[in-house]
């Protein structure tokens, strides 16, 4: 299953399959997730080691048993790949690292006014993988405001150095935020020239294209079909690049197919997995296991659940079957692709779905009246769980926020439905940033069921929580995916990085905002909060957040929206925007429903019809 816990001061011994430099453990974990054989990783921050060569070292590891011995190493961080973790799988990495220079091939230098502008330039340059920016206070005046666009053979820095007044980060192309746009066309009987960066075997051009999209240096590809004249080159997928970023030439060639990486597509990238099953095809590779199962779909599920399995073949040969079950061959290879593809066999083959974003779990969890005042504009995909709850009577308007917690579930505040309990009048918009982008053609979700907490009473602050079941499940994308829920009764975690988001008023007597706003707000203890609200009872099922001096808060229109906190690189839904005295007033923190206290209720209500809780446990 999915394991998200990080082990501090621990290093996995042995099992190395690759190593690289990464700026933090989260980026190292992402590289492990996308590496075909990596199950575990260990990361050495700069503070953890004196050896300059090993600083920022990210070590990717495999293990036949799925685990390795941990040795104590001060400062080291270790963890698991996020394969099998559904919507948490993403190649998108937005963080900017201060005081760090990520080295690589510098191919473009320009003057820009901010690190955000530098990141945008990298994202809009086809060859840029990461960048470094020298700030206004950099020690050498001639380098100040320099934005260096970079690439490397592996897509990660060739070295990382601690350097004052330098900020570094990665391209946001994997976040589907590139302005370049992409070529969706696939060209028959055409071979591209230029430099081959990798060679893999694939059953069709679509798989070849997806592999190209997620390969750090692939810009375009040529695929040799299974009827290509040279037998040894059949089903070969050549991943390619060029200095210019486009093919310098193409040659008409029977039975070849060429196309482009889709990494520069805006707003939508293909999933990093291949779900199609290929009948009459055998995939060869290293044998991991052989099991008898009923049907090719069960074989694929078995492969997906066995984390080291990369692809499979389900044999229908009479000698491989007994009763209704046949042999399911679970296989793997060094590069994650079959080592041999044979056609016209009595088998059906396909790939593990361990890297699919979607998963089929409806709620993500972990084991172990109000709007934003003093906030700033959010950017695309920054808060992909945020939804807008709108009411359509004669006109249509935004009333509340909400959080997507599963394919078919939204968590919000019960008071949003005060006087409006009819599900037909509500429209739920997900995957949006600007309310002005909503037109009559914008898709929205309708409500199948509103589940208000049984102890909630109108105009009381207690149990201000409600679940919405959507009529149809939503697909997950970079812009629309769920937030994980905290552990039941989560009291031990100290959250220091918490944010509130919404489209609500920007001042007490204001109006709904167009662009989704965000504000970083510290949590306040319940004792402190109770002192500020002596006329109200602040219960242990509430959580408060705010600055003593005020100025930043949620406000009208933010109700029901998320209070999220980042811990160990993972966002969790800590609170639901509920109430407060005015907005952003001095010594009047915002009050939020404490989600951890309602985990039993949430899980009970989101149980599937067969009585099994459809939830994801990453830890």
């Amino acid at each position: 299953g999915c394991l998200t816990q990080l082990y501090e001061n621990a290093f996995f011994r042995g099992g190395d399959v690759a190593s690289m430099y990464t700026p933090n453990a989260q980026y190292c974990q992402m590289r492990c997730t996308f590496h075909p054989r990596c199950l575990l990783f260990s990361f050495l921050p700069a503070s953890s080691i004196n050896d300059m060569e090993k600083r920022f070292g990210c070590f990717l590891k495999d293990s036949v048993t799925g685990t390795l011995p941990k040795v104590h190493r001060t400062g080291a961080v270790s963890g698991h790949s996020l394969k099998q973790c559904g919507h948490q799988i993403s190649a998108c990495h937005r963080d900017i690292y201060k005081g760090v220079d990520m080295r690589g091939v510098n191919f473009n230098v320009s003057k820009v006014s901010s690190v955000e502008e530098c990141q945008k330039r990298c994202t809009s340059n086809i060859r840029c993988q990461f960048f470094s920016y020298a700030t206004q206070t950099f020690h050498k005046a001639e380098y100040r405001n320099n934005c260096l666009l970079k690439y490397s053979p592996g897509g990660t820095p060739t070295a990382i150095k601690v350097l004052s007044n330098v900020e570094s980060g990665f391209s946001l192309k994997p976040c589907a935020l590139s302005e370049i746009g992409c070529h969706m066309n696939i060209f028959q009987h055409l071979a591209f020239s230029d430099v081959d960066v990798a060679r893999v075997l694939t059953p069709d051009a679509f798989v070849c294209r997806t592999i190209c999209t997620y390969h750090p240096n692939c810009l375009f590809f040529t695929f040799y079909t299974n009827v290509w004249k040279i037998e040894s080159q059949r089903n070969v997928c050549l991943l390619k690049t060029s200095e210019s970023g486009t093919p310098s030439s193409s040659t008409p060639q029977e039975n070849t197919i060429s196309g482009y990486s889709l990494l520069t597509c805006k707003r939508t990238l293909p999933e990093p997995c291949h779900s199609k099953i290929y009948p009459g095809v055998d995939f060869g590779g290293e044998e991991l296991n052989v099991t008898f199962v009923k049907g090719v779909n069960v074989c694929q599920e078995t492969c997906t659940k066995m984390i080291r399995c990369q692809f499979f073949t389900y044999s229908l040969l009479p000698e491989d079957c007994k009763e209704e079950k046949c042999k399911c061959f679970l296989r793997l290879s060094m590069d994650g692709s079959p080592t041999r593809i044979a056609y016209g066999t009595q088998g059906s083959s396909g790939y593990s779905l361990r890297l699919c974003n979607t998963g089929d779990n409806s709620v993500c969890t972990t084991k172990t009246s109000t709007r934003i005042v003093g906030g700033t504009n959010s950017s695309w995909g920054e808060w992909p769980w945020q939804v807008s709850l709108q009411v359509k009577l004669t006109a249509q308007r935004h009333l509340c926020g909400g959080s997507l917690i599963g394919h078919q579930w939204v968590l919000t505040a019960a008071h949003c439905f005060d006087g409006l309990p009819l599900q037909d009048v509500w429209r739920i918009y997900s995957g949006i940033l600007n309310l002005s982008d909503i037109t009559k053609d914008t898709p929205f979700s309708q409500i199948k069921e509103i589940i208000i907490h049984q102890n909630y009473k109108v105009s009381e602050g207690n149990h201000d929580i409600a679940l919405i079941k959507l009529q149809a499940p939503l697909n997950y994308t970079e812009f629309q995916k769920p937030i994980c829920l905290p552990s039941k009764g989560d009291t031990s975690t100290i959250y220091t990085n918490c944010w509130v988001t919404g489209w609500g008023f920007s001042k007490e007597k204001g109006e709904i905002q167009n662009i989704l706003q965000k504000v970083n707000i510290p949590l306040v203890t319940n004792e402190e909060c109770q002192k500020r609200y002596q006329d109200y009872k602040i219960t242990q099922r509430m959580v408060c957040a705010g600055y003593k001096e005020g100025g930043k808060d949620a406000c009208k229109g933010d109700s029901g929206g998320p209070l999220v906190c980042k811990h160990n690189g993972m966002w969790r839904l800590v609170g639901i925007t509920s109430w407060g005295e005015g907005c952003a007033r001095r010594e009047q923190p915002g009050v939020y429903t404490k989600v951890a206290e309602y985990m039993d209720w949430i899980l009970e209500k989101t149980q599937s019809s067969d009585g099994k809780a459809q939830m994801q446990s990453p830890a």
């Epitope: 969706m184 066309n185 696939i186 028959q188 069709d204 051009a205 679509f206 695929f223 079909t225 299974n226 009827v227 039975n255 197919i257 293909p270 999933e271 779900s275 199609k276 099953i277 009948p279 009459g280 056609y343 016209g344 066999t345 009595q346 697909n475």
Partner: antibody, heavy 119, light 107 residues
């Protein structure tokens, strides 16, 4: 010129049999996966059956499974569809089609042959 | 089996009009989607493969888009020879299934 030419259609009684042929020319027939697709009068297209180049793997729509058999003779560049236990609902124009390798689209179609099942 | 639903089932348009036909799959089919044109008494003809790629010899006024479950065929400026029935077809899984067709008629 790449071409597919069907033959063998006609009028047959319910329960009867018929064998359709599809002669290919202008391309290396033995390299391509071939399929049969049918269209009932005034209706849409329905995939019927497919066969790999070597003939080692065949596939059928549920509606014809156990009654129809697809086969090929690569030495004669010909595709066949043996239809047994014919029913009135099998009445249709039958097209043979070539599948583009690596893309899974029917790029070349024959002109079709009409099969009428009626008493 | 994957169901393919086309809309509208028929439409009337004039020469020069922009025409859009949609096709929805009952489950995600990635980009494994093809479009065909069929004229009365003739065999179907491949127009678009892989959701958006134009088959050789097909005029550039035809274009396709979409991925996952929702797909669109667009004719930017309808010509007299474009009056026909259009079918979408998924090749993601067997049985390969077609939409019920959209008949484009002269207004």
């Amino acid at each position: 010129e790449v071409q597919l030419l069907e033959s063998g259609g006609g009028l047959v009684q319910p329960g009867g049999s018929l064998r359709l042929s599809c002669a290919a020319s202008g391309f290396t027939f033995s390299s391509y996966m071939m399929h049969w697709v049918r269209q009932a009068p005034g209706k849409g297209l329905e995939w019927v059956s497919g066969i790999y180049p070597s003939g080692g793997w065949t596939d059928y729509a549920d509606s014809v499974k156990g009654r129809f058999t697809i086969s090929r003779d690569n030495s004669k560049n010909t595709l066949y569809l043996q239809m047994n236990s014919l029913r009135a609902e099998d009445t249709a124009t039958y097209y043979c089609a070539r599948l583009v390798a690596g893309l899974d689209a029917f790029d070349i179609w024959g002109q079709g042959t009409m099969v009428t099942v009626s008493s | 089996d994957i169901q393919m639903t086309q809309s509208p089932s028929s439409l009337s348009a004039s020469v020069g009009d922009r025409v859009t036909i949609t096709c929805r799959a009952s489950q995600s089919i990635s980009s494994y989607l093809n479009w065909y044109q069929q004229k009365p008494g003739k065999a179907p003809k491949l127009l678009i493969y892989a959701a958006s790629s134009l088959q050789s010899g097909v005029p550039s006024r035809f274009s396709g888009s979409g991925s996952g479950t929702d797909f669109t065929l667009t004719i930017s400026s309808l010509q007299p020879e474009d009056f026909a029935t259009y079918y979408c077809q998924q090749s993601y899984s067997t049985p390969r299934t077609f939409g019920q067709g959209t008949k484009v008629e002269i207004k």
